[in-house]
Every structure is written in structure tokens, then in C-alpha cells.
């Protein structure tokens, strides 16, 4: 069920997964949609009673979808957007008057103004928000400064009240950056820079798609079932570089070698990875079996069970006869496969909750 | 592969589950190794730089079961016994000196010595360790005084030095407490006190050793797979009073009632689940997916895969009459199933690597 | 007001039989536990034997097992110490008393709730 409201001054109770750092609670609500075990959240609104609180959005999560209430003053409380029908973007164009975003600063340099200090952290491959002191900042030397920060979550480390100066994201997630949009992707290659995460995937394509939406992904080096080396199979690298370019390219066979697509503008999806993996395991966290008639209303199922991120379907040879088989519907802590075996029989896919969420814009 | 030694000056970069705190290295690997899911820990010792981290037992785990050794003054780390075949107990009868263990202290009384006061911990249902204030301790209202603690889990929320004080904890896993054991299990029958928490069990029997080994829980009640509710099917609540003992006891069909074998002298296995589970899915999250011949093979299986806790074996016809089936090696946050499901023809059942770690000793 | 009374106490020969009882008022034996206790003349008071009302698990010490049995009756809110094959040591003054928190069973320091007593004497 869709709830857009928010209720203010409660309090979720319990089924913390983490704690981030929002400028506000709509803010708080597109985060907690936007990751993958996300159902529920509460933001610390500036009137809460504990000043070292404020601004925190605590993500959380139900098996039962649900979290009892409690009365706090200042606490605001919400439902994720996974259980709305409507489109969705991550892009975030407001900016936020004496809030100072925090992380590291990795550039600072004077622009004219905030609209100019945002589109150099959107034009920047780095740059995940910014703070820019006004002319009216307190200290002479600070003023008109712009700086470009990042984290290694993508939201600030906390934010804290500060007269005259204001704060905003990057709009790379609007389509707006004019960073070059990089579609090859390189057979026989490893890129072998930062590993900043690891995680498990079909294919290249679906590496791709999880580096676009990891905040700190730049590229991105896929190692395919094929790779000698049992343990990096189906293993997605995902990668970064100060320079936010591959600095050493390695000839490998079964190997594949990308870049993210968060600076392109997509005529194609990027969140939700719609094709079927056949004779492919998707091993998880088991959400339930069901009986269903078919791969395709396996994927049906997993879509419209909230809390489903993945699935197998499995089929012997007499219920393949009668039409029927065993729906796996599945989850983990990243939205990702914990392993994926090949050869079994099973039928694997993603949910296709996710493909509300991309962007809808014009091929750049 | 069984590794006891400890590495001094160590500490295992990553893979963090929580943080307890314990007196020494020693007692942190048993901690670890009881725990569900780790399999290495660093203890941070009092020669670490850090003082607010001193006794601090960091619980680790990983998929490849080993991580990065980085050189750290005062770091102790180590692997988790699971790995190893000797038989295992909780029991510590060390005492402490100079150390006050931190909890709520819920009773204090005068005790003649440190071994009357941990003998009190011991016969105390509430009692998870103790400290006591010797006759030299400087505050002389606070001499011979016998503190007895207890916490959320079992383990204290901090360690200080504290001059002339010395702690202990609670004898009962030696099996030394006088404490009543009732072992009865109460058909028709819901007690109707605090829940402290709830895990998903096949049955009232694993839901008591679950009880037993829990820190807090005193008695439970369990739901079967027949009761009404869906929700509550297979659900197994573990239970507290002030008292010790349930105030209510109400009749309900479907239900089972009981206590906590935590003062019984066990003459059978309280620890371990060997039992089989016909027609029973247990759900959980992935670990492997093998093919081989009968149940019996499959518990075998997730018996010597070390991160393997539960298992479900499942074979369709045609491979049922060649003697093979698929065998589903799974693992939780707690160590039980996520959820139980019925009618669908699997055979499942528990790893027996926990059935070293009974206490081994006569009837009470 | 608590109100334990334990009666059936009396004289006899060695090798012979007694009933006690213990009847409550103002306290519930359900779901708690209740004990018999002795003490002898210049002795310290110890444990007999106890009974957890809820399910009826029984607990006595080595020096009864076999010759005593504890019971109950939840509708009269009454418990009963059934003494056969009676000695000389088991002179002494018997006291019924009632638990409120999970207890060593046989551990007369940790009981609430005590009777008066009744005295027990076996004559060989």
C-alpha cells in the first residue's frame, strides 16, 4: 500500500539498517526508496529536543512492513516510495539556506554564485554536494568560495546550521551534467585502480547498471562465469581513480571493462535489469516459495512483493510438463546475488519495481 | 582449519558484526565462537593506544573466513573455535581482579567474600556476572558489597579498571547453579509476559534449547505450525519477569509453554538440533546450492561448511528414485530460519558443529 | 495477609507414617514454588523437599528420596508432604513456606512467605 504522508512528530520504532544525513524528510523518503532494503524511515527535524540528532535520517526496515509509532517531539516518520506506482527520480534541484552539507572537501574555488558552485560539483566526476558561502559570509576570506564534497556513501557525514551559506547535490541524477557519457563497454579488460566495492552480477550489463547507481563508481571491471578463478566469477569490481579515469588497462580474457552511466542522459533503463538468466541460480536471503505457472510469473510475484529484490525459478521435469515450477523469491543487504550458480536449471531474474525509478529523458 | 593460537598486535581489518566487551582475548574467541555468525574477532587490550576502547571485542565475519592483518599495538586477534573439533564450553569460573564490569545492577548485599558473591550471580536467575568491592576498597560503605549485573545480552556494556574491586561472571553454563530445572513443556499453554525476542522454530523443543542458550530468556512460549494466526506459525517467544517465573498462564490450543534448561545438569544435547524435519522448507539466506545423495549426506554437508547453520534437502521424483536430491546450505542473523514452510516435500534440519559445545555432564 | 498454617505434625514410632499439610490464604501456590523445611533442636533449618506448582516438578533432599513425597492440591490451594518409613533424625519442627521468584529449590534463604511450624517427633 502507497502512503506519501508523513507523520510528524512520530517516532518508527526499532528495524534500524542505518543512519545517513538528509536537509530534510522528503529528502529522507527518496533515500530510503532508493536503497535496497529501505521500507521505512524517521528524520530528526530541527525541533527535536537532541541538537546532536538533527538532520539524521534513520533508515529502516519491516518484515512485517510495518513499525509501531511512538510520540517524539520534532521526530517526522514516512514510508518509502516502493510500495507508490509512480515514476521516481533521485534528482534533487532544491538548494538549502544556512545548511552546511558536510564530507571532504576536495575543491574549493570562488564562483559567482550558488547556481554556478552547483554546476561545477554536477560537472565534476567526484563531486556528490557542495556548500557555497554567500557574500554575506562572517569571514572576508571565505566568501564566494564553493566546495566540492564527496563521501563514500554519497550523503553528507552530518549537516549543521550555518548562517549564510547554502548547500545542494549534484544534478548528475537530473541528466544535467556535461561530463562525457562513455557507453563501451571492453572485452578482454580489466581496469586495476580502487576497488571501492564488490558485488555479484549476471553480466556486464547489469555491472553497469550497479556502478550508474553507486555513488562513488566511475567504472567498473566485470569478471565473466568463464574466469579461471572460481571465487571472482560473476564478480562486479566496482572502481574509482583520483584522475576519475582508468589509469592502467590489463588484456584479460573473460573479463569485460565499463564506465558509469550517471552522465548520460538514458534512452534505455539503468535502475532495473529486465532479462531473464536461464540455467542461472540466484542465491540470497530466502523472502518465500510459491508455486506459479511459469519464469515470467515468477518475475510478477517478486515485483509486486516489496521486500523481493531477486528470484529463481525451478522446474523439475514433471512439473515443467504440467506448466507449473517453484518461485524463489529473494533478497540481500545490497539488492545483489550473495552467489550465483550456473548450470541447475533454474530460470533468474530482478524485480521490475526498480524501472519506476529511472530517469525518463531524451538519449544524449 | 583449526587455527588456536592468537595474534598479538594484530587487528582484522573488516567484517564487522557488533562490539561486546570481555575481560580478555580469551574469553572474547569463546564469545565469538558462541555467537551466531562470527568466525574471527579482535580484542583491543589495555596496551592499546585508545583507552575508550580497551576490552572492546569485535565480533567478525567473512565469506572467504579470513581478513586483512594490519599491525595495531594492543590488538589481540584470533579465529572463532567453530572451525575446531574439541568439544566446547561457556563455562568461566575466572575471577577478575581490578576490572568492574558494567551492567545494571539490579541487587547489592553483603557478601563475605568474592566466591559467596559469585556463588549469589550464580543462583540468581537475572545474574549474568557480578563485581564485588573487597575490604580494601577505598569507600568504606561500599566494602564486601556484591553487585550482581545483568544486560540486554548477556555480555557487560563496559570494562574499567577499578582499584580493589574484582568481577566474575555467573557459574550457571558450569552447570553449579541450585536454581530450580523445570522441564516440563506445557501443552495448550501461553505464558503471557515480556517477549525479549522471537526466532522462527520447527518445534517446542528447539524453541527450549533456544531459550536455554538465549542470555535473558527465562520460559517461552511456542506456536505451531496448526495455530490460527499465519503470522505466528512456528514462532518461538522467548519470555522474561521480574520474578522469574510466568505470572499468567493461559489456555490456548495449538500453543506450548516451557523453561529454560539454563539450571539443569544436561544429560542430553541442549545445544545442538540433530533431528530431521519432514515435509519442512527452512528459509534462510543462501549459502550454496550441492547435489547429493539423501539428507542425511546434506546435513553431513552444512555440518563441515563452517558458515553453514541450517539446511533444507529437496528431490523431485526422478531424482528421488536415483537416490539424489539438491541440498540447500543456509545460514541467518540469529542462527534459525527466517521462516518454516510446510507441504512442499523438503527435509530439513541444523548444522551438529554445535553439538561440541554442550556442556558435558551428569543429570540433575 | 499471608497466612501459611501446616498442620498433621504428631508423635510416632520409628518406621511409621505422618501427612502434613499446608493450607495458604492470601498467596496463590500457582506458579510459584513451596517448600518443606525442618530444623532441629541446635540445627540449622534445611531444605526437605519442593514442589513447583505449575506442572508439579518435584525436588527433595538425598536424605528423604524415596520415604517423602511432595503434592499438591491447586483447587484447595493446599500442599502436602507424605512422610513414610520415618526415622529418629527426622525429629524436628516443619515448616511449609512459599516462593514468589525462581528459587534453589531447597534453599530456605530464598523462600517469602513461612508458617509457624509443626513439630514432628520420631521416638525408636
Known amino acids: 500500500e502507497c502512503v506519501i504522508k508523513l507523520f510528524s512528530d512520530i517516532y518508527f520504532q526499532g528495524g534500524d539498517i542505518t543512519t545517513v544525513y538528509t536537509p530534510n524528510a522528503k529528502h529522507c523518503q527518496v533515500v530510503c526508496t532508493y536503497h535496497p532494503r529501505c521500507l521505512l524511515f524517521t528524520f530528526m527535524a530541527e525541533s527535536s529536543v537532541d541538537s546532536t540528532k538533527w538532520f539524521s535520517c534513520i533508515l529502516k526496515d519491516s518484515v512485517t512492513e510495518s513499525l509501531p509509532k511512538v510520540n517524539m517531539t520534532g521526530a517526522i516518520s514516512g514510508y518509502s516510495f516502493k510500495q507508490c506506482p509512480h515514476q521516481l527520480s533521485a534528482c534533487n534541484k532544491d538548494i538549502y539556506v544556512d545548511l552546511d552539507m558536510q564530507g571532504m572537501n576536495y575543491n574549493g574555488s570562488v564562483t559567482k554564485n550558488a547556481q554556478e558552485c552547483q554546476e561545477r560539483c554536477t560537472n565534476d566526476a567526484h563531486c556528490h554536494f557542495f556548500t557555497y558561502a554567500t557574500r554575506q559570509f562572517p569571514s572576508a576570506e571565505h566568501r564566494n568560495i564553493c566546495l566540492l564534497k564527496y563521501t563514500q556513501t554519497g550523503a553528507p557525514t552530518g549537516i549543521r546550521k550555518l548562517k549564510k551559506v547554502v548547500s545542494g547535490f549534484s544534478l548528475k541524477s537530473c541528466a544535467l551534467s556535461n561530463l562525457a557519457c562513455i557507453r563501451d563497454i571492453f572485452p578482454s579488460t580489466v581496469f586495476a585502480d580502487n576497488n571501492i566495492d564488490s558485488v555479484v552480477a549476471p553480466d556486464a550489463l547489469v555491472c553497469r547498471r550497479i556502478c550508474t547507481h553507486h555513488p562513488n563508481c566511475l567504472f567498473f571491471t566485470f569478471f565473466s562465469q568463464e574466469w579461471p578463478k572460481e571465487s571472482h566469477r560473476n564478480l562486479c569490481l566496482l572502481k574509482t581513480s583520483e584522475s576519475g579515469l582508468p589509469s592502467t588497462r590489463i588484456h584479460k580474457n573473460q573479463a569485460l571493462s565499463g564506465f558509469s552511466l550517471q552522465n548520460c542522459r538514458h534512452s534505455i533503463p539503468v535502475f532495473c535489469h529486465s532479462s531473464f538468466y536461464y540455467d542461472t541460480d540466484f542465491l540470497g536471503e530466502e523472502l518465500d516459495i510459491v508455486d506459479v505457472k511459469g519464469h515470467e510469473a515468477c518475475q510478477k510475484m517478486c515485483t509486486s512483493a516489496i521486500r523481493c529484490q531477486f528470484f529463481t525459478y525451478s522446474s523439475s521435469q514433471e512439473s515443467h510438463n504440467k506448466g507449473k515450477g517453484t518461485c524463489y523469491l529473494k533478497l540481500s543487504s545490497n539488492g545483489s546475488p550473495t552467489k550465483i550458480l550456473h548450470g541447475r536449471g533454474g530460470i533468474s531474474g530482478y524485480t521490475l519495481r526498480l524501472c519506476k525509478m529511472d530517469n525518463v529523458c531524451t538519449t544524449k | 582449519e583449526c587455527v588456536i593460537k592468537l595474534f598479538s598486535d594484530i587487528y582484522f581489518q573488516g567484517g564487522d558484526i557488533t562490539t561486546v566487551y570481555t575481560p580478555n582475548a580469551k574469553h572474547c574467541q569463546v564469545v565469538c565462537t558462541y555467537h551466531p555468525r562470527c568466525l574471527l574477532f579482535t580484542f583491543m587490550a589495555e596496551s592499546s593506544v585508545d583507552s575508550t576502547k580497551w576490552f572492546s571485542c569485535i565480533l567478525k565475519d567473512s565469506v572467504t573466513e579470513s581478513l586483512p592483518k594490519v599491525n595495531m599495538t594492543g590488538a589481540i586477534s584470533g579465529y572463532s573455535f567453530k572451525q575446531c573439533p574439541h568439544q566446547l564450553s561457556a563455562c568461566n569460573k575466572d575471577i577478575y581482579v581490578d576490572l568492574d564490569m558494567q551492567g545494571m545492577n539490579y541487587n547489592g548485599s553483603v557478601t563475605k567474600n568474592a566466591q559467596e558473591c559469585q556463588e549469589r550471580c550464580t543462583n540468581d536467575a537475572h545474574c549474568h556476572f557480578f563485581t564485588y568491592a573487597t575490604r580494601q576498597f577505598p569507600s568504606a560503605e561500599h566494602r564486601n558489597i556484591c553487585l550482581l549485573k545483568y544486560t540486554q545480552t548477556g555480555a557487560p556494556t563496559g570494562i574499567r579498571k577499578l582499584k580493589k574491586v574484582v568481577s566474575g561472571f555467573s557459574l550457571k553454563s558450569c552447570a553449579l547453579s541450585n536454581l530450580a530445572c523445570i522441564r516440563d513443556i506445557f501443552p495448550s499453554t501461553v505464558f503471557a509476559d515480556n517477549n525479549i525476542d522471537s526466532v522462527v522454530a520447527p518445534d517446542a523443543l528447539v524453541c527450549r534449547r533456544i531459550c536455554t542458550h538465549h542470555p535473558n530468556c527465562l520460559f517461552f512460549t511456542f506456536f505451531s505450525q496448526e495455530w490460527p494466526k499465519e503470522s505466528h506459525r512456528n514462532l518461538c517467544l522467548l519470555k522474561t519477569s521480574e520474578s522469574g517465573l510466568p505470572s499468567t498462564r493461559i489456555h490456548k490450543n495449538q500453543a506450548l509453554s516451557g523453561f529454560s534448561l539454563q539450571n539443569c545438569r544436561h544429560s542430553i544435547p541442549v545445544f545442538c538440533h540433530s533431528s530431521f524435519y519432514y515435509d519442512t522448507d527452512f528459509l534462510g539466506e543462501e549459502l550454496d546450492i550441492v547435489d547429493v545423495k539423501g539428507h542425511e549426506a546434506c546435513q553431513k554437508m552444512c555440518t563441515s561448511a563452517i558458515r553453514c547453520q541450517f539446511f533444507t534437502y529437496s528431490s523431485s521424483q526422478e531424482s528421488h528414485n536415483k537416490g539424489k536430491g539438491t541440498c540447500y546450505l543456509k545460514l541467518s542473523s540469529n542462527g534459525s530460519p527466517t521462516k518454516i514452510l510446510h507441504g512442499r516435500g523438503g527435509i530439513s534440519g541444523y548444522t551438529l558443529r554445535l553439538c561440541k559445545m554442550d556442556n558435558v555432564c551428569t543429570t540433575k | 495477609q499471608v497466612q501459611l498454617v501446616e498442620s498433621g505434625g504428631g508423635s510416632v514410632q520409628a518406621g511409621g507414617s505422618l501427612r502434613l499439610s499446608c493450607a495458604a490464604s492470601g498467596y496463590t501456590f500457582n506458579n510459584n514454588f513451596v517448600g518443606w523445611f525442618r530444623q532441629a533442636p541446635g540445627k540449622e533449618r534445611e531444605g526437605v523437599a519442593a514442589?513447583?506448582?505449575?506442572?508439579?516438578?518435584?525436588y527433595y533432599a538425598d536424605s528423604v528420596k524415596g520415604r517423602f513425597t511432595i503434592s499438591q492440591d491447586n483447587s484447595k490451594n493446599t500442599v502436602y508432604l507424605q512422610m513414610n518409613s520415618l526415622r529418629a533424625e527426622d525429629t524436628a519442627v516443619y515448616y511449609c513456606?512459599?516462593?514468589?521468584?525462581?528459587?534453589?529449590?531447597?534453599?530456605?534463604?530464598?523462600?517469602?512467605?513461612w508458617g509457624q511450624g509443626t513439630l514432628v517427633t520420631v521416638s525408636s
Open positions: 514442589i513447583y506448582s505449575l506442572g508439579g516438578s518435584t
Open positions: 513456606a512459599g516462593a514468589i521468584t525462581w528459587v534453589p529449590p531447597l534453599s530456605h534463604r530464598r523462600y517469602t512467605y
